[in-house]
């Protein structure tokens, strides 16, 4: 901590400028008001200040706000918002998406540190649930975001937040995540006429109970084998070959070449041998 | 509860062929849902997976013991069977049976069986 | 065949501390994967199965994650049964195989 010293004539500030860059550490915490810097954060980021000054300036600003800061300071924070720790951050309450949107941009191109992942709990706790412009932004800055959450975090995002998942925002999701996901998305494009619909719903396929699969199977689909490689496997396995053949249709020829992984291999061992060889691809069960 | 149980002898000489079975109780070998395995692990080593077996027959072997194993299933006496040939000291071993259930994984395992192969 | 890479091989720890141990997979496995605890003179017992679902019965500080090739079995706070040692294995392929095995050990 910088020690309290009285700060020498002619030096008080009287607004955030460049001149601070020459100001020593003990000068800055005796010559910048606090409730100044409070004021002028947003000329904080146009200054090279060095990471020594900065952690006097948050000093400052952690005495005039023990309680946490209020989000007019907080959305001009910039590059300050490195230098705040988690627990900091749990005093906050950040409820603009504006906000949100700066600090990410602060930590952009990086992967997501403790700090943000707190900045990103507690925006989306104050707000109760996921909504899609939130989700939006949240994928932006973070692809992988979406499968960082748990099974229970995921419960909370609506239907309608759905619209805004990518595909590649659910390439990292694990089986229990997409049992989560895959019924809100079903409700989200449950309007859509079939091919538009297995297009949307085709990235949420792995949490697909054996149903849906069958009746997508009566609809020339066409999955790919790489979909059909991310099913449950308990949906998989009661699905016979004649319904298989249909959901892959021209793709059927791409389970050869898989026979000796999961979920088909699991789904080959449990078919009649005849029923395989209709398929006509060499498969032994 | 389901519960496996490994038997067979605890000595094999070299160049002979180690037999073992592995009873299934308080379940059915038949089960939809399981394969049946054999594991191995050397003493002070990891685990080796040996093989597999489906009720209906369908076996799957690890590609480098291949030339040498046999497992067999006897659905009449809920049991699976192991059938190691050639048999030298690397293959002294704690042999474990285990039910490979499909949605999870190795769930249920016997106390294992200690075969030391030696003249 | 797969190999499955795990690390550290043995690792120290107290009662309380946080143990992460890592398995690598020489190639994508999806979330085929799963995590046995084994004790002396033990059949290994499964703790996670599809890289992150708690087997029945396993306490909750066990914890697993990841998918593809990266995978990570966490102890939230260890407790003396469990100085074991830890075995990933891939189920993906039909030719199954386990890492090398991760000893934990009192400090």
């Known amino acids: 901590e910088v020690e309290k010293t009285a700060c020498p004539s002619g030096k008080k500030a009287r607004e955030i400028d460049e001149s601070l860059i020459f100001y020593k550490k003990w000068e800055l915490e005796a010559c910048v008001d606090a409730a100044l810097l409070a004021t002028q954060m947003d000329r904080v980021n146009a200054i090279p200040f060095t990471y020594e000054q900065l952690d006097v300036l948050k000093h400052k600003l952690d005495e005039l706000y023990p309680q946490g800061y209020p989000e007019s300071v907080i959305q001009h924070l910039g590059y300050l918002f490195l230098k705040m720790s988690p627990e900091d951050i749990r005093k906050w309450n950040v409820t603009s998406l504006e906000t949100l949107k700066a600090l990410l941009e602060v930590n952009k191109g990086h992967e997501m540190s403790p700090q943000v992942a707190t900045l990103i709990d507690r925006f989306v706790k104050g707000r109760g649930q996921l909504d899609k412009d939130t989700l939006d932004t949240l994928t932006a800055f973070y692809p992988g975001y979406l499968c960082s959450l748990s099974p229970e975090e995921l419960s909370s995002v609506p239907p309608s937040s759905i619209w805004a998942v990518r595909p590649q925002d659910l390439d990292t999701c694990d089986p229990r995540q997409l049992d989560v996901l895959y019924p809100k998305a079903r409700l989200a494009f449950q309007n859509m006429n079939g091919s538009e619909y297995f297009v949307k719903i085709q990235s949420f396929l792995g949490g697909a109970p054996t149903e849906d699969l069958k009746a997508l199977s009566q609809q020339n689909v066409s999955m790919d084998l790489a979909t059909f490689m991310k099913l449950r496997t308990d949906a998989v396995l009661p699905l016979t070959v004649a319904e298989v053949q249909k959901l892959l249709g021209p793709h059927v020829e791409g389970l050869k070449a898989e026979e000796r992984h999961r979920p088909v291999r699991d789904w080959i061992l449990r078919q009649r041998q005849d029923d395989l060889d209709t398929l006509g691809l060499g498969l032994q069960g | 509860q389901v519960q496996l149980q490994e038997s067979g002898p605890g000595l094999v000489k070299p160049s002979e062929t180690l037999s073992l079975t592995c009873t299934v109780s308080g379940g059915s070998v038949s089960s939809y849902y399981s394969t049946w395995s054999w594991i191995r692990q050397p003493p002070g080593k990891g685990l080796e997976w040996i093989g597999y077996i489906y009720y209906s027959g369908s076996t799957n072997y690890n590609p480098s013991l291949k030339s040498r194993v046999t497992i067999s299933v006897d659905t009449s006496k809920n049991q699976f069977s192991l059938k190691l040939s050639s048999v030298t000291a690397a293959d002294t071993a704690v042999y474990y049976c285990?039910?490979?259930?499909?949605?999870?994984?190795?769930?249920?395992w016997g106390q294992g069986t200690m075969v030391t192969v030696s003249s | 065949d797969i190999q499955m890479t795990q690390s550290p091989s043995s690792l120290s720890a107290s009662v309380g501390d946080r143990v992460t141990i890592t398995c690598r997979a020489s190639q994508s496995i999806s979330s085929y994967l799963n995590w046995y605890q084994q004790k002396p003179g033990k059949a290994p017992k499964l703790l996670i199965y599809a890289a992150s679902s708690l087997q029945s019965g396993v306490p909750s500080r066990f914890s697993g994650s990841g998918s593809g090739t990266d995978f990570t079995l966490t102890i939230s706070s260890l407790q003396p049964e469990d100085f074991a040692t830890y075995y990933c294995?891939?189920?993906?392929?039909?030719?199954?195989?386990f890492g090398g095995g991760t000893k934990v050990e009192i400090k």
């Open positions: 294995q891939q189920s993906y392929d039909a030719s199954y195989t």
């Open positions: 285990a039910r490979d259930f499909v949605l999870s994984g190795f769930d249920i």
